[in-house]
């Protein structure tokens, strides 16, 4: 907290250039009107104030706007941005895209604060949905934003965004956030060929049923290991070898490496043993020949 | 984290020249402006001088013409020449600067060094 002092005489500011530098920090906030300062924020930015001044212009700024900053204000704060907490920043109505870029800038690098957080946590409730371009913003600073919301936040998030989301946006994703995921985007490019399709909607595969799997074995995809380890367990069970084989294409001499992860390693346990060994990969753990399998969970369905 | 550390202080006659350093090592990366600052026996900490990371500069007008501030950053060193010294210099000078980390500002000095001016 600064002490009220008088502005010594000739030293009060008609403009915010750099001989504001130079003022200690009584005389800042002495000689500087605080509605000055608000018209001149674009001036701000671009003069390198000191650490303590910083702190002496957010004072100023939370006198005159005790309600939160106008967006005019917000989208010029530059380094000032790093001065708020969550709670001046929850005071805020951040509306154009334009502003939340600008700060964003400002963090760019390292990763996402609290203060950034709650910054996009009021941008996209103000919008009411995450649209195409914010998310293309966002994904752009902070590649894991996606993986960072609540399966119920996802569900805000239109087909016609799925277009921005790049695969490595989705790399720390759980299936629970897949599952909401993948049928927005079997949505988004439900009209693109064979090839292009699987190529776009590859990185979205945690999240699809069997249904799916077996329709893509059709396609001959050639999915690799990486991805196919990434599937639902319970997706892939149902399938049988054939249907892995088609899947996987060339990629299926893999399954042996993989044999003692899931959902290898359950999905073996589900195949006949002489179904496996027709693929000629030495995979162990089927069922053995001659035994009869009951499918108990279709028995209790049926009952 | 950055470290600043300051040398080139010493006791010189009045319109003698000295030459500050400033080393700066670890995030160094993330530095932007930096500043160099005095304070006097007895009084408050004042701004001599700063320069951005683009390389523009400025001084306080009680130095102007007698006081350079320069950058080398393949270096990562900070400068204060100092010419025609006065009495009224005598002061430690400290090297400053912030950087963003974490999503809040981090403020940075030297220890400082000792400047002291004959007359």
């Known amino acids: 907290e600064v002490e009220k002092t008088a502005c010594p005489s000739g030293k009060k500011a008609r403009e915010i250039d750099e001989s504001l530098i130079f003022y200690k920090k009584w005389e800042l906030e002495a000689c500087v009107d605080a509605a000055l300062l608000a018209t001149q924020m674009d001036r701000v930015n671009a003069i390198p104030f000191t650490y303590e001044q910083l702190d002496v212009l957010k004072h100023k700024l939370d006198e005159l706007y005790p309600q939160g900053y106008p967006e005019s204000v917000i989208q010029h704060l530059g380094y000032l941005f790093l001065k708020m907490s969550p709670e001046d920043i929850r005071k805020w109505n951040v509306t154009s895209l334009e502003t939340l870029k600008a700060l964003l800038e400002v963090n760019k690098g390292h990763e996402m604060s609290p203060q950034v957080a709650t910054l996009i946590d009021r941008f996209v409730k103000g919008r009411g949905q995450l649209d195409k371009d914010t998310l293309d913003t966002l994904t752009a600073f902070y590649p894991g934003y996606l993986c960072s919301l609540s399966p119920e936040e996802l569900s805000s998030v239109p087909p016609s965004s799925i277009w921005a989301v790049r695969p490595q946006d989705l790399d720390t994703c759980d299936p629970r956030q897949l599952d909401v995921l993948y049928p927005k985007a079997r949505l988004a490019f439900q009209n693109m060929n064979g090839s292009e399709y699987f190529v776009k909607i590859q990185s979205f595969l945690g999240g699809a049923p069997t249904e799916d799997l077996k329709a893509l074995s059709q396609q001959n995809v050639s999915m690799d290991l990486a991805t196919f380890m990434k599937l639902r367990t319970d997706a892939v069970l149902p399938l049988t070898v054939a249907e892995v084989q088609k899947l996987l294409g060339p990629h299926v001499e893999g399954l042996k490496a993989e044999e003692r992860h899931r959902p290898v390693r359950d999905w073996i346990l589900r195949q006949r043993q002489d179904d496996l060994d027709t693929l000629g990969l030495g995979l162990q753990g089927g069922i053995p020949n001659g035994y009869l399998v009951l499918d108990l969970s279709m028995q209790e369905a049926l009952s | 984290e950055v470290q600043l550390v300051e040398s080139g202080g010493g006791l010189v006659q009045a319109g003698g020249s000295l030459r500050l350093s400033c080393a700066a090592s670890?995030?160094?990366?993330?530095?932007?402006?930096m500043y160099w600052y005095r304070q006097a026996p007895g009084k408050e900490r004042e701004l001599v001088a700063f320069?951005?990371?683009?390389?523009?500069?400025n001084v306080r007008d009680s130095v102007k013409g007698r006081f350079t501030i320069s950058r080398d950053n393949s270096k990562n060193t900070l400068y204060l020449q100092m010419n025609s010294l006065r009495a009224e210099d005598t002061a430690v000078y400290y090297c400053?600067?912030?950087?963003?980390?974490?999503?809040?500002?981090?403020?940075?000095w030297g220890q400082g060094t000792l400047v002291t001016v004959s007359s």
């Open positions: 320069i951005s990371s683009g390389g523009s500069t």
């Open positions: 400053n600067t912030y950087i963003p980390y974490g999503g809040t500002l981090h403020d940075f």
């Open positions: 670890g995030s160094t990366s993330s530095i932007n402006t």
